[in-house]
């Protein structure tokens, strides 16, 4: 039987500063149950980025479909990056409980920001 | 197309155990959550159960007395269902789940049910 | 638990008339309702998701609207088929998955 896995297909990501910056992420199942999030960094100081249900993220939008059944993507659109947003993102899964319990991360993507063109 | 096939329903005396089966077809079963789901006669519908991939998820009325249980080699669902009680009676309906967005369950495809029922 | 009340519990409705139903949460469940019908002797059957998303092969007839804690499911011209009972199913915080106890649409 196959595991679930998260694949970020992007290694790296370069995009200039206040362009928007696309996230890949995809799992191969449904389940376990429980969501994904997004976070920049790795350890107890990671800095949330999405979490579909809790918070407010302004900037980041799914790029599927909300209302899309059965969805499997899990990329994200990051607008108006700056050089503050450089770093590496990680697509978590998270198995549900009390509280949700992190099951498998994706390789992450290293997001690295360009000076505007002038 | 999909379909969902109970079928271990019957009459069982208080203390007594059923397990029911859920064949499933027409869908990648193994990516997908399931789920049982019960109708006490003339009530509304009541969720007992849900399993994930080895995650489970019980109603506080049936934990410690039912397993859910998948395999997905056969395609089937299962419950196990011990120390049954009269307020167990009910029409027991395999479901399956469906997500929208990035997490929320509900049930799409369902069975026709199969009736148990706990009387001495 | 989040408790889904449903209102009216019967409606005696005619053919061709519009019918509304109505879904309160004793919290916010966003936007994370479902809508199913079931006839007598049958299965529940998924006609909305998402509050306002009609499974696929639902009439048009059918709608879902609202958010937070008021949903409403209206039928713009029910049709002799519609007879039934309706509930509404909440996902947003789970377990447990709950159900509204239902509203009975029978024939006037």
């Known amino acids: 039987e196959e595991e679930l896995q998260v694949i970020q297909p992007e290694k790296s990501v370069s995009v200039a500063a206040g362009e928007s910056a696309t996230l890949n992420c995809t799992a191969t199942s449904l389940i376990p149950v429980g969501p994904i999030q997004w976070f920049r960094g790795v350890g107890p100081g990671r800095e949330l980025i999405y979490h579909q249900k809790e918070g407010h993220f302004p900037r980041v939008t799914p790029v599927s479909d909300p209302t899309k059944r059965n969805n499997m993507d899990f990329s994200i659109r990051i607008s108006n990056i700056t050089p503050a947003d450089a770093g590496t993102y990680y697509c978590v899964k998270f198995r549900k409980g009390s509280p949700d319990v992190e099951l498998k991360s994706g390789a992450g993507t290293e997001l690295s920001v360009r000076a505007k063109p002038s | 197309e999909v379909q969902l096939v109970e079928s271990g329903g019957g009459v069982v005396q208080p203390g007594g155990s059923l397990r029911l089966s859920c064949a499933a077809s027409g869908f990648s079963f193994s990516i997908y959550a399931m789920s049982w789901v019960r109708q006490a006669p003339g009530k509304g519908l009541e969720w007992v159960s849900t399993i994930g991939a080895d995650d489970t998820y019980y109603a506080d009325s049936v934990k410690g007395r039912f397993t859910i249980s998948r395999d997905n080699s056969k395609n089937t669902l299962y419950l196990q269902m011990n120390s049954l009680r009269a307020e167990d009676t009910a029409v027991y309906y395999c479901?399956?789940?469906?997500?929208?967005?990035?997490?929320?369950?509900?049930?799409?495809?369902w069975g026709q049910g199969t009736l148990v029922t706990v009387s001495s | 638990e989040i408790v889904l009340t449903q209102s009216p519990a019967t409606l005696s409705v005619s053919p061709g008339e519009r019918v509304t139903f109505s879904c309160r949460a004793s919290q916010n469940v966003r936007s994370d309702i479902a809508w199913y019908q079931q006839k007598p002797g049958q299965a529940p059957r998924l006609l909305i998701y998402a509050a306002s998303s009609r499974d696929t092969g639902i009439p048009d007839r059918f709608s879902g609207s609202g958010s937070g804690t008021d949903f409403t499911l209206t039928i713009s011209s029910l049709q002799s088929e519609d007879f039934g009972v309706y509930y509404c199913?909440?996902?947003?915080?789970?377990?447990?998955?709950?159900f509204g106890g239902g509203t009975k649409v029978e024939i006037k």
């Open positions: 479901a399956k789940d469906s997500t929208v967005g990035w997490s929320g369950d509900f049930f799409d495809y």
């Open positions: 199913q909440q996902y947003y915080d789970w377990p447990p998955f709950t």
